[in-house]
């Protein structure tokens, strides 16, 4: 709980925000968890704390580890953990999966690609953008504020996009790069009221206590590109991100598939180390688009670890 993964490349700037949000201006103390050593606040240090931010200027592979932040007040201290991994720079063009931020989808009408994490940095426009390691050139590409706009998007525009910018700290400049995949959606088609293919309404899913369990929410919304379509899981009517149980997570990103020409999305709910209290929760698969929302409810039941065969 209150833990966040952050990653960066050696010799680049990396800025991490304390996962335990307070309000601005509160005192935040940072520690290197393995040694419980306090992170200095003096900016002359390569790694230093600045309020809710932990700054690596620049980062080194040896900086990898878990950092503890404590938002302090006289009556209520709040602790968070930043799991930081610094990787060596790749010699080739390929960006490995572990360096990729979440995938974004675009269409002819909407083709913004936001540069991940950029809001944490002190940067000035323009951003540099690369696709599959090639600098983007031509009038179709416009770097605007913290995002890239592609005019007249085509299927060929799908790929890995890297933004590169300079972070400035007290007159010193540090390079930062961040990469995410971009997929292109077909514009032609139609939209329907969502149809949930799985799970069935009021389905009972058998799980084993102590084991992992997966629930898949799958729904179709029409044919071709859908302007607004989403599937998600809720626990007791609350979004997974707000529910605050780290053992229960939605799979990052939604998979779009085309079944018999239909545009379908699925979202996998992963429950690690199933506990008794998980059986008491109501799991709702929600599918929504411009036509409305459909909900299928699932409950978990205990499955005996040993199956008895006659």
């Amino acid at each position: 709980k209150f833990s966040k993964q952050s990653w960066g490349l050696e010799n680049e700037a990396l800025i991490v925000r304390c996962p335990r949000q307070g309000k601005p201006s509160y005192t935040v103390d940072w520690y290197y968890s393995q040694t419980n050593k306090s992170i200095p606040t003096q900016e002359r240090n390569r790694v230093f704390a600045s309020g809710q931010l932990l700054k690596f200027l620049p980062a080194a592979v040896a900086d990898s580890g878990i950092y503890t932040c404590i938002v302090r007040s006289p009556t209520f201290n709040r602790t968070g953990y930043a799991n930081v991994t610094i990787y060596k720079k790749q010699s080739d063009c390929n960006v490995p999966d572990y360096l990729m931020y979440s995938t974004v989808s675009g269409s002819e009408k909407n083709s913004k690609i936001y540069c991940p994490t950029i809001d944490l940095y002190n940067w000035t426009a323009p951003l540099e953008w690369f696709k599959n390691c090639q600098a983007l050139q031509g009038s179709r590409y416009r770097a605007h504020k913290s995002f890239l706009v592609i005019d007249n998007v085509m299927t060929e525009d799908a790929g890995d996009y890297t933004c590169k910018f300079i972070h400035n700290e007290n007159g010193a400049n540090y390079s930062v790069t961040a990469t995410r995949s971009f997929t292109v959606k077909d514009e032609q088609g139609f939209s329907l009221f969502p149809v949930i293919g799985a799970p069935a309404q009021n389905e009972i899913k058998e799980v084993e206590i102590g084991k992992n369990a997966n629930l898949t929410c799958s729904a179709c919304f029409g044919k071709g590109t859908q302007f607004l379509a989403a599937v998600l899981w809720q626990l007791n009517g609350t979004k997974i991100t707000d529910f605050g149980e780290p053992r229960i997570q939605q799979e990052e990103g939604q998979n779009q598939s085309f079944s018999n020409g239909l545009a379908c999305l699925d979202m996998v709910l992963r429950i690690a180390d199933v506990k008794e209290e998980d059986l008491l929760l109501q799991y709702d698969c929600l599918a929504l688009n411009l036509h409305g929302l459909r909900r299928h409810t699932v409950r978990l039941s205990r499955k005996n670890p040993i199956d008895h065969h006659s």
Epitope: Q21, Y26, P74, D242, G244
Partner: antibody
């Protein structure tokens, strides 16, 4: 958007127990923060009753501690106030509110509880 | 318990003028470089609304006409310039220790 809504009987008899519930939407109360009860007698100022934090740990105002219990129902995303042995002096508008650290940034609309026979 | 005393109990201000409310604590509410004093606005029939936290920090979405200052035991909420819809009760609250306490309130009326 975080929203809080108080509910419970508007009239309680003296010596009985006042019971109120605060239903939270837009945020899971077990995710983080502290969840407070505050009251305001008609035409008077505010009095902090106590809070329960995301982990279920409670802190009460010593002036009411012997009569107060704050608890949480995670399945309904609600937290509750019980105030025993009430008297007319407990007549007030009761508010629930969220504390990020120690100021209260989201409040319910409040519910008036009258103690009368 | 820390007792918070607000003054004046009420004041009437013309639109465009400055309104100043003070809050005095029975002991210091400052420690470790911060002052744990907060200000709320309460309009009739509504719950309080957080205006200022940590003595001088403007809560998100609150107009910059509101400002707070002070440290130790003496704190001030200033509204400048006052507008017609600022008619309300204003409360200070400390969080230096348990229990949290509020001031008795100051009623601001617009002439």
């Amino acid at each position: 958007q975080v929203q809080l809504q108080e509910s419970g009987p508007g009239l309680v008899k003296p010596s009985q127990t006042l019971s109120l519930t605060c239903t939270v939407s837009g945020y899971s109360i077990t995710s983080d923060y502290a969840w407070n009860w505050i009251r305001q007698p008609p035409g008077k100022g505010l009095e902090w009753i106590g809070y329960i934090d995301y982990s279920g740990s409670t802190t009460y105002n010593p002036s009411l501690k012997s009569r107060v219990t704050i608890s949480v129902d995670t399945s309904k995303n609600q937290f509750s106030l019980k105030l025993s042995s009430v008297t007319a002096a407990d007549t007030a508008v009761y508010y629930c509110a969220r504390t990020v650290i120690d100021s209260m940034d989201y409040w319910g609309q409040g519910t008036l509880v009258t103690v009368s026979s | 318990d820390i007792v918070l005393t607000q003054s004046p109990a009420s004041l009437a201000v013309s639109p465009g003028q400055r309104a100043t409310i003070t809050c005095r604590a029975s002991k210091s509410v400052s420690t470790s470089g911060h002052s744990y004093m907060h200000w709320y606005q309460q309009k009739p029939g509504q719950p309080p609304k957080l205006l200022i936290y940590l003595a001088s920090n403007l809560e998100s979405g609150v107009p910059a006409r509101f400002s707070g200052s002070g440290s130790g035991t003496d704190f001030t909420l200033t509204i400048n310039p006052v507008e017609a819809n600022d008619t309300a009760n204003y409360y200070c609250q400390h969080s230096r220790e348990f229990p949290f306490t509020f001031g008795q309130g100051t009623k601001v009326e617009i002439k």
